[in-house]
C-alpha cells in the first residue's frame, strides 16, 4: 500500500492528512477562518491547486501522480492568526521495487492491454496489482485478467472500457512478505494510448483516365469526428525495380473518404494500402490489406 506521511510543521497546527484512495487532503477546521487554500508541488515544480470543498477544511485532487513524491501544503488564515503546514508524501518501500516500464494501449476500439516489468530490486515473491480510475475519480476498476510471468503479474487485459474517460489514473501497487514495495502511478490520456485499426472497406474504381480509392474511417474508442483523422495512402506499382520509392499520399479525413488520381489505360498492375492516425498525435495504425488494381493487359476496372 502507499506510504505513511510525515508533516513539516508543529503537530498541533492543522493536522493535515491525505487519503490516497480518494485523493482527499483534509485538515482540522479552524474557527473564524477568513482564507484557506491547498496545493501540491511535484518534483517537476508543477503546482496543482484544487477547489476547496464546501466545508473549507478539505480539497480533492484529480489530475495528479504521486509516485515520484509530492509535497502538499495548506494555508489557513483566521481572524486571529495564520497557519501553514506542509505534508511530505514519499513513496515508501525499498527503492527500485516498483513496477517499471509501464505502458497501456487501447486497440480494436474496446480492448486495452497494460504491461509493466518487475522492479529491479523487487524480491522474488513480489506481486503487483493494477487499479484504474477515471480522472474524475468516480469509479475504480480492478484488473480483471492479469498477464503473468512466473506467477508475477506483469500486465493486464481489459475487455470492458466503459468506466474510462478521456484521461485515466493507473496505479500499480505491490506486495511482498519480505519488504515494502513502492507503488507506481500514471495519468494517461486515451488520445495518446489509442492505436487505431487500419481503415476498412477499401475499394478502388477506375475509369479510362482516373482511379478513385474509397475507405471508411476506423471505429475508435474515442468519440472522434472525421476532422480528427489523417490518412496515408501507399500506391505501389507492381513489378518495379527494387528500391523504387512508393508514392505516399497524405489525405485529411472527410465526411466521405476518397482519393482520386490520374491513371490512364492501359494500366499496369498496382496495389494500394491505407493507414490512419489521429491528426494531433500521428500514431499510425498498421496498413490495411493491399488492394490490387490494373493488370498486365489493363482490363480490370473495379476492385474490392
Amino acid at each position: 500500500e502507499k506510504s505513511d506521511l510525515r508533516t513539516v510543521a508543529p503537530a498541533s497546527s492543522l493536522n493535515v492528512r491525505f487519503d490516497s484512495r480518494t485523493m482527499n487532503l483534509s485538515w482540522d477546521c479552524q474557527e473564524n477562518t477568513t482564507f484557506s487554500k491547498c496545493f501540491l508541488t511535484d518534483k517537476k515544480n508543477r503546482v496543482v491547486e484544487p477547489r476547496l470543498s464546501n466545508n473549507e477544511c478539505s480539497c480533492t485532487f484529480r489530475e495528479i501522480c504521486l509516485h515520484e513524491g509530492v509535497t502538499f501544503e495548506v494555508h489557513v488564515n483566521t481572524s486571529q492568526r495564520g497557519f501553514q503546514q506542509k505534508l511530505l508524501y514519499p513513496n515508501s518501500g525499498r527503492e527500485g521495487t516498483a513496477a517499471q516500464n509501464f505502458s497501456c494501449f487501447i486497440y480494436n476500439a474496446d480492448l486495452m492491454n497494460c504491461t509493466w516489468a518487475r522492479g529491479p530490486t523487487a524480491p522474488r515473491d513480489v506481486q503487483y496489482f493494477l487499479y484504474i480510475r477515471n480522472s474524475k475519480r468516480r469509479r475504480e476498476i480492478r484488473c480483471p485478467y492479469y498477464i503473468q510471468d512466473s506467477g508475477t503479474h506483469v500486465g493486464c487485459h481489459l475487455d470492458n472500457l466503459s468506466g474510462l474517460t478521456s484521461r485515466n489514473y493507473f496505479l500499480v501497487n505491490g506486495t511482498s512478505r519480505e519488504i515494502g514495495i513502492q507503488f507506481f502511478d500514471s495519468l494517461l490520456d486515451t488520445k495518446k494510448i489509442e492505436r487505431f485499426n487500419p481503415p476498412s472497406n477499401v475499394t478502388v474504381r477506375c475509369n479510362t483516365t482516373h482511379c478513385l480509392v474509397r475507405w471508411k474511417q476506423p471505429r475508435t474508442y474515442q468519440k472522434l469526428s472525421y476532422l480528427d483523422f489523417q490518412y496515408q495512402l501507399d500506391v505501389h506499382r507492381k513489378n518495379t525495380q527494387p528500391g523504387t520509392e512508393n508514392l505516399l499520399i497524405n489525405v485529411s479525413g472527410d465526411l466521405e473518404n476518397r482519393y482520386n488520381f490520374p491513371s490512364s489505360e492501359p494500366r499496369a498492375k498496382h496495389s494500394v494500402k491505407i493507414r490512419a492516425a489521429d491528426v494531433r498525435i500521428l500514431n499510425w495504425s498498421s496498413w490495411s490489406e493491399a488492394i490490387e488494381f490494373g493488370s498486365d493487359d489493363g482490363h480490370h476496372h473495379h476492385h474490392h
Epitope: 508543477r46 484544487p50 489530475e63 488520445k191 497524405n250 492516425a277 494531433r280 498525435i281 500521428l282
Partner: antibody, heavy 123, light 107 residues
C-alpha cells in the same frame, strides 16, 4: 464557432492586483479547460497555467505560485486570471486560450485564443 | 522542461519565394508539435498540429514535417499576408513550451 473575448487593457501600480476576464461563447465553460499564455513586449509566448472550470483544479508552474489565481464563473461562462503583488516584469499581453482536446496541464494545440489583454505595471 | 529553439531568428524573403523555418526540441517530443502564426496586434493562430496536419482553414501552401527533435514549417509560395512571426510549441511533456519565434519579413 467558439470565441474567447477578453476584458480591456489595464494600467496598475507595483504591488497592486489585476483581474483579467475571458468570456466564452459557442461552448459552455464547463466543457473546456482554459489556459493562460503571456507575452512580454517584443518577446515570445509563455504558458502560465491551465484551469478546469468544472472541478476548479488549476495546474501551473511553481514560479507563478502565490501570485496567480485562475477561477471561473460557470453561470456567465467567464474565466478569470488574477495577478497579485504586481511587478514591472508582469507588464505583458495576457491571452486566454483553449483547444478541442485539452486538460489542465496542456492542450493538443491551442485552437482558440482571446484577443489578449495588455496589463501595464508602472509607478 | 523541454526547450524549443527556432532558427533563423529572422528570415527575409520576397513574395512568391519558398520559406523554410526550423524548430528543434531539447529532447524528443514525438509528433506532439504545433505551429502558430502571429501578426502584429493579433493573437496567435494555430496553423499545424501533430507536426504535419493543417488546422481548419489553413491554406495548403503551409506544410509541416519532422518528428522527434527536428521540425520544419514550409510555406511553398509566400503571399503578402504570410509575413508574420511563427512559433513552434510542444505538447508532449509538461509544461507546454514555445520556441522564441521566427520573424518572417519582406525583403
Amino acid at each position: 464557432q467558439m470565441q474567447l473575448v477578453q476584458s480591456g487593457a489595464e494600467v496598475k501600480k507595483p504591488g497592486a492586483s489585476v483581474k483579467v476576464s475571458c468570456k466564452v461563447s459557442g461552448h459552455t465553460l464547463t466543457e473546456l479547460s482554459i489556459h493562460w499564455v503571456r507575452q512580454a513586449p517584443g518577446k515570445g509566448l509563455e504558458w502560465m497555467g491551465g484551469f478546469d472550470p468544472e472541478d476548479g483544479e488549476t495546474n501551473y508552474a511553481q514560479k507563478s505560485q502565490g501570485r496567480v489565481t485562475m477561477t471561473g464563473d460557470t453561470s456567465t461562462d467567464t474565466a478569470y486570471l488574477e495577478l497579485s503583488s504586481l511587478r514591472s516584469e508582469d507588464t505583458a499581453l495576457y491571452y486566454c486560450a483553449t483547444g478541442r482536446y485539452c486538460s489542465t496541464d496542456t492542450c493538443y494545440g491551442f485552437d482558440y485564443w482571446g484577443q489578449g489583454t495588455l496589463v501595464t505595471v508602472s509607478s | 522542461e523541454i526547450v524549443m529553439t527556432q532558427s533563423p531568428a529572422t528570415l527575409s524573403l520576397s513574395p512568391g519565394e519558398r520559406a523554410t523555418l526550423s524548430c528543434r526540441a531539447s529532447q524528443s517530443v514525438s509528433s506532439y508539435l504545433a505551429w502558430y502564426q502571429q501578426k502584429p496586434g493579433q493573437a496567435p493562430r494555430l496553423l499545424i498540429y501533430g507536426a504535419s496536419s493543417r488546422a481548419t482553414g489553413i491554406p495548403d501552401r503551409f506544410s509541416g514535417s519532422g518528428s522527434g527533435t527536428d521540425f520544419t514549417l514550409t510555406i511553398s509560395r509566400l503571399e503578402p499576408e504570410d509575413f508574420a512571426v511563427y512559433y513552434c510549441q510542444q505538447y508532449n511533456n509538461w509544461p507546454p513550451t514555445f520556441g522564441q519565434g521566427t520573424k518572417l519579413e519582406i525583403k
